[in-house]
Interface confidence: low
């Protein structure tokens, strides 16, 4: 009963538990003397039904049996599963304008009985955890219901823990709070779940196991790795275990890995040799432990040791590129390039580079260690160079790699023939060429360089460069390449001692240019007229620039103009024209052309020749 | 049987700091689960922070996460709670909890100490 009930009381037929389905009876009765003062025959009994606090029904229609003035009985069906709330309350009828007074309440709960628990799983989490036993209870009953675990064993050992399900909290999980020791690995031992509720009972079958069944060690602990003589490739993993583990499992990974190194171990003692790790690398590393070799179940993961393994000296070879440069008549400058090594051959932080120039003949030598990846030097343009480079870190230096120092585009006999460039998408271009005609040395290697055209490339930018072996023709440069803007692309071939090049221009992507080139004078020299511009600035080309066209046309005329093409070179801003007729006023005007169209007009200029006509 | 003795608690001006600490007898320590839960004055119990048996995992209810740490100390058998920046709404009898595994339900419990922020 929900309220202190002074008015009178509320009972349920045949319970105020009822199954699924089921109709109950409600009787409402007031105590003696309570009811509407003046007209006891005016007692009006009515039954309010609530669903979550909320009234739902008025049961006045429902109403079986009534005794005038003194009590009421209600049938109530198709009641919902949970719990539903029935209020009954007093009219007196007289009173219109007083609301019904509440004389008791009464709760109903709909639910079913437990089903038989199933899938009965028990584990014990380390030598010294407690068993602790989990099922599956089946459908929700709706109602509170109590769950017994019992547990029996050898030398009549007996053990229950209870705990209950209802709308707040799930019971489908006990720790029973004992401990299975490791001398009772041979014993059996039977779990069985009872579940009771108001509407019934159930029982689980009995579910038997052993110690090695049941038992999950606790995940190894205290893990670390010692590695030998500082090796960056072996150490010894070491942690600490439960006495009874008798095979770990170990995983490792470098961190950036998607896949593990599995290893399993038996009898280990909490030690393990690895031999295969790479250097100068971030591992994890993760063990996992069983008590028994063909039974029982493996332990959680460790928590991760996270370590990086020592250096090792580098290995592989740098790839190394230069530039020539004659600054005097005896004096060369010499750029060194080079790239950096992998992390798998760099095996270690690189300290530095040393970089050696040696002239053959004379045995000069240049010596010098620098961190960058790149270094120059002026030196005599006589004598044949030779220049090595070498990787160091803290455990030692990688093996000198060697480039003889060659005239790069000296050797017409060793010009690469028909190089083209096409451009594959926004970011690539592919590089073709046909190799030399009549060489008479044997190419030993292509060198594909390309930098964009830009002011100030050659000394702000270090070259791209790609090695391609003799027996290829083709190159897909990609490095650094980025749309809309000129690359020009080298074609180096070298022999022993010498060098041919080729030269061509490649973008990945082309448009218009956004404006034409300005026109800053026009001059008349012996019956020429010479048109000087400035070239487009870098952004606005938008690609590599095909040709510039010079257009004109006498003044207010409304004729299509004359124009002439000419093939777009770096250095070239001006060119002469020969075909205007004398004292006519024209108007001239430029604009350049990409292979995606040709740009809007540059500036207007207007010039009147005074000379004879050709 | 295990008993867990809680110390610490007191009366602290809001923004301040204390720290609780937590002792269990009667089991290995480094084999039990533990956890700090607290109950306001007319309100449930309900949990604060809780720490596995190694340390390595740790879970913080949303209302103290960057104001509360959890830690452990198995060569001091103690279970501890930092709590900072303490709020009014904080004040309420602190209990410490033990369980045999991560797993488990809580099965043992302290008999709290009081923790008091005053505006």
């Known amino acids: 009963n929900i309220d202190v009930c002074k008015l009178g009381t509320v009972t349920v037929q045949p319970a105020p538990v009822i199954p699924l389905g089921s109709a109950a009876n409600i009787s409402c009765s007031l105590n003696p003397k309570q009811g509407c003062s003046h007209y006891p025959s005016s007692n009006e009994l009515i039954l309010l039904k609530f669903v979550n606090d909320v009234l739902v029904e008025n049961l006045h229609g429902k109403k079986v049996h009534d005794h005038t003035g003194h009590s009421s009985t209600f049938q109530v069906t198709n009641l919902s599963l949970g719990m539903t709330l029935f209020v009954c309350k007093l009219n007196c009828s007289n009173s219109q304008k007083k609301p019904p007074v509440p004389v008791c309440g009464v709760e109903i709960s709909v639910g079913v009985a437990p089903e038989p628990p199933q899938n009965i799983s028990c584990v014990q989490e380390g030598e010294n955890g407690t068993v602790a036993c989990s099922w599956n209870s089946g459908k929700v009953t709706y109602l509170k219901t109590n769950y017994t675990l019992q547990l029996s064993g050898p030398n009549n050992l007996t053990c229950q823990k209870q705990c209950f399900s209802d709308n707040r909290q799930n019971c489908n999980r006990l720790d029973l709070g004992i401990n299975l020791s490791p001398d009772l690995a041979e014993s059996r031992f039977i779990v069985r779940v009872t579940a009771i509720n108001d509407l019934g009972n159930s029982s689980s079958l009995p579910h038997t196991f052993t110690f090695l069944d049941i038992v999950i060690p606790l995940p190894p602990w205290d893990i670390r790795i010692n590695f030998l003589n500082a090796s960056g490739s072996r150490g010894t993993l070491q942690w600490e275990d439960e006495g009874q583990v008798v095979l770990n499992q170990l995983r490792y990974q470098p961190l950036n890995s998607t896949s593990w190194n599995m290893v399993n171990a038996t009898n280990a003692k909490g030690k393990y040799d690895l031999r295969d790790l790479r250097p100068f690398t971030e591992y994890e590393f993760q063990i996992s432990s069983k008590l028994h070799l063909s039974g029982g179940s493996w332990s959680n993961w460790s928590e991760s040791l996270r370590t990086r393994t020592p250096e090792e000296e580098p290995v592989g070879i740098l790839d190394i590129w230069y530039m020539k440069q004659d600054i005097d008549y005896d004096r060369q400058q010499i750029s060194l390039f080079w790239k950096s090594l992998n992390p798998s051959e760099a095996r270690g932080k690189i300290l530095h580079y040393q970089v050696t120039l040696q002239e053959v003949t004379k045995k000069t030598t240049l010596q010098n260690t620098t961190r960058h990846t790149s270094w120059t030097r002026v030196i005599p343009r006589t004598g044949a160079w030779t220049a090595s480079v070498s990787a160091a870190n803290s455990k030692g230096a990688s093996a000198p790699t060697h480039i003889n120092i060659v005239d790069l585009c000296g050797t017409g006999l060793l010009a690469p023939h028909q190089v083209s460039a096409k451009s594959e998408n926004m970011d690539n271009i592919l590089v073709t060429w046909q190799p030399p005609k009549k060489a008479d040395s044997a190419v030993r290697e292509y060198i594909v360089e390309w930098r964009a055209l830009q002011p100030g490339s050659i000394t702000k930018f270090p070259p791209h460069w790609l090695r391609i072996p003799p027996d290829n023709m083709s190159a897909l440069i990609s490095e650094n390449i980025k749309p809309y803007i000129c690359y020009e692309i080298r074609v180096h071939a070298l022999s022993e001692s010498q060098g041919g090049c080729s030269s061509i221009r490649g973008d990945s992507k082309h448009k218009a240019p956004v404006s034409g080139p300005h026109i800053t004078a026009i001059t008349e020299k012996k019956e020429r007229l010479f048109i000087s511009w400035t070239h487009i600035p870098f952004p606005e080309q938008r690609g590599c620039i095909l040709h510039y066209r010079i257009y004109w046309k006498e003044r207010d005329s409304t004729a299509q103009p004359e124009l002439c093409e000419i093939q777009y070179r770096r250095s070239q801003n001006s060119h002469p024209i020969s075909s205007l007729q004398p004292r006519v006023t024209y108007v001239l005007w430029m604009t350049a052309v990409t292979a995606a169209g040709e740009s809007p007009q540059g500036n207007e200029r207007e010039f009147c020749p005074q000379g004879k006509a050709n | 049987q295990v008993q867990l003795q809680e110390s610490g608690g007191g009366l602290v001006q809001a923004g301040g700091s204390l720290r609780l600490s937590c002792t269990p007898s009667?089991?290995?320590?480094?084999?039990?689960?533990m956890g700090w839960f607290r109950q306001a004055p007319g309100k449930e119990r309900e949990v604060v922070a809780t720490i596995s048996w190694s340390g390595g995992r740790t879970y913080y209810a949303s209302s103290v996460k960057s104001r509360f740490t959890i830690s452990r100390d198995n060569a001091k058998n103690t279970a501890y709670l930092q709590m900072n920046s303490l709020r009014p709404d904080d004040t309420a009898v602190y209990y410490c909890?033990?369980?045999?595994?991560?797993?488990?339900?809580?099965?043992?419990w302290g008999q709290g100490t009081q923790v008091t922020v005053s505006s």
């Open positions: 909890a033990a369980r045999g595994t991560d797993y488990g339900a809580y099965d043992y």
């Open positions: 009667g089991r290995t320590f480094s084999t039990l689960a």
